[in-house]
């Protein structure tokens, strides 16, 4: 509309008692330069006088009359574009409508701006993303609809009352579109942050508390589990029983399914929080864990290494190398599955016990023909003695001896 003056400024400005207000403002008059400017508080039009009545906070006229409020209120504008204002300090009773009465040579205009001054510093507002998931970086935003050049403030982030270590980025806006102070914090929440209180605290330049906003974190996370085993050391003997219990220490949202895994493979028909293993065999040794799922995904407990102890199995002998040439070296190795590992070995040559040989390996540095024959062994651990296996044959090759001519 060409019959109107054009103004741009925030619709409402917010402040509190004792602070200040900075009003960014631009205008375009219909014709010529500004000749007179009056700032009213709660102006009312008087039809009888065809003038505005109200408290005059600021006056700039040709005759140079200046109201007493002039020291507190400053017009920082000019005659054709800028109508920026500052009130410092601002008082509770400044709340209401500010009226900018502008007059050029031939035209007049009253522009209204709302001012909301509270008794105490009002709280900032924390903005969270719609969903927070563990270990996924999010940006927490703290917004305060206030900024003023004459009144420095700071926004500080606290987690459970303790300042957060992450670096926050604070920005201010003092434009005709918006006036605010904003602090943004990048944060990778862990599952343990679920339910914790985050605070954005408004402080003055000296760090004195002015106001705050708090939110409770809702961190979506996979179930967090604890596995307990009886016996606690997870060492049993064949035929014993074992009980494993899975406890959910935290889940958000609630868990839906439970399963057990052995060596990474799911155990069939084991879908409760207790795993009972009766009369265990050595094949049941391995790494066990429980897996509980929710809408976020599956959570796994730490692994429990179940050791099923048993006496040594029948031994086998490995010979390095047979056949062997007389004078060469040979090594025998006694192999037997056992838990715990065998502590003692008994060696046999052609069925006769080799005295003093109790190690897993037997080394012959210089083979002679008489070493030839069958070697077998027996392994022993704390649970018993194994059986002698079939043994291995050592063949010793040697040159002719005692050559006789016929």
């Amino acid at each position: 509309d060409s019959s109107k003056w054009v103004f741009e400024h925030p619709e409402t400005l917010y402040a509190w008692e004792g602070a200040c207000v900075w009003i960014p403002c631009t205008y375009r008059a219909l014709d010529g330069d500004l000749e007179s400017f009056i700032l009213f508080h709660n102006p009312e039009y008087n039809k009888n006088t065809s003038k505005f009545d109200g408290t005059r906070l600021y006056e700039s006229t040709k005759d140079g009359k200046v109201p007493s409020e002039q020291k507190r209120v400053q017009f920082l504008g000019d005659k054709n574009k800028n109508c920026t204002l500052s009130i410092h300090p601002v008082h509770l009773n400044d709340s209401g409508q500010l009226g900018l009465r502008m007059e050029s040579k031939t035209e007049k205009w009253m522009e209204r701006i709302h001012l909301n001054v509270s008794e105490r510093p009002f709280p900032p507002h924390i903005q969270l993303p719609p969903e927070i998931q563990e270990s996924q970086e999010v940006t927490l935003t703290c917004l305060l609809n206030f900024s003023c050049y004459g009144y420095p403030i700071q926004l500080q982030w606290l987690l459970e009352g303790v300042p957060m270590r992450q670096a926050a980025v604070t920005s201010t806006s003092l434009t005709i579109k918006s006036v605010f102070t904003r602090s943004e914090l990048k944060f990778s929440p862990q599952w343990s942050h679920h339910g914790k209180i985050v605070t954005c605290q408004l402080q003055d330049a000296d760090g004195k508390f002015l106001s705050n906003d708090t939110v409770q974190l809702n961190v979506k996370h996979t179930p967090k589990l604890e596995i307990k085993v009886t016996p606690s050391d997870a060492i049993v003997r064949e035929g014993d029983s074992v009980t494993m219990t899975c406890e959910v220490s935290s889940s958000n949202p609630e868990y839906t399914t439970v399963s057990w895994l052995k060596d990474g493979t799911s155990l069939k028909k084991q879908n409760t929080f207790t795993l009972n293993l009766r009369e265990v065999t050595k094949d049941q040794s391995g790494k066990y864990c429980c897996q509980v799922s929710n809408d976020v995904g599956p959570g796994r407990s730490e692994e429990v290494f179940l050791q099923v102890q048993y006496a040594p199995e029948p031994s086998t002998v490995q010979i390095l190398h047979s056949p062997a040439v007389e004078g060469s070296q040979v090594e025998f190795l006694c192999m037997s599955l056992a838990n715990p590992l065998p502590t003692n070995y008994t060696w046999y040559h052609n069925g006769k016990e080799m005295q003093g040989r109790t190690e897993e390996k037997v080394h012959i540095p210089k083979i002679l023909p008489w070493h030839a024959g069958t070697y077998s062994c027996v392994a022993e651990n704390i649970l018993g003695t194994g059986q002698r296996g079939p043994g291995a044959e050592l063949d010793v090759q040697y040159p002719p001896k005692k050559v006789t001519t016929v």
């Epitope: 040559h349 080799m354 210089k366």
Partner: nanobody, 122 residues
């Protein structure tokens, strides 16, 4: 081709000491094991101690443990049986024998020395 020669036997008073030696020559030396046996009149040969040439420590019969010490001298192909705190029941003919391993039965030894007499008087 294997010869075993014992030495060091004799008469000694109870509580005294003797050192028996066995020198090996031929194919039995340097690889395999040497054993000492004893045979009292009217009794069978019994294992006393044994040791391998290449490695491992000596093996003793329970009756001599703590009193007898068996050692080897690979350079001279000789084994020594140091006998301390001798008792009258140690009286016997002492034989050294060779086998691929230390066995407790005399049947498993292939070569034998001629024996040396040890007499312990009370």
């Amino acid at each position: 081709q294997v010869q075993l020669v014992e030495s060091g036997g004799g008469l000694v008073q109870a509580g005294g000491s003797l050192r028996l030696s066995c020198a090996a020559s031929g194919r039995a030396s340097g690889s395999g094991a040497m054993g000492w046996f004893r045979q009292a009149p009217g009794q069978e040969r019994r294992f006393v101690a044994g040791i391998e040439w290449s490695s491992g420590g000596p093996v003793y019969a329970d009756s001599v443990k703590g009193r007898f010490t068996l050692s080897r001298d690979n350079a001279k192909n000789t084994v020594h049986l140091q006998m301390n705190s001798l008792k009258p029941e140690d009286t016997a003919v002492y034989y050294c024998a060779a086998a691929p391993w230390v066995f407790s039965s005399p049947d498993d030894y292939m070569y034998w020395g001629q024996g040396t007499q040890v007499t312990v008087s009370s």
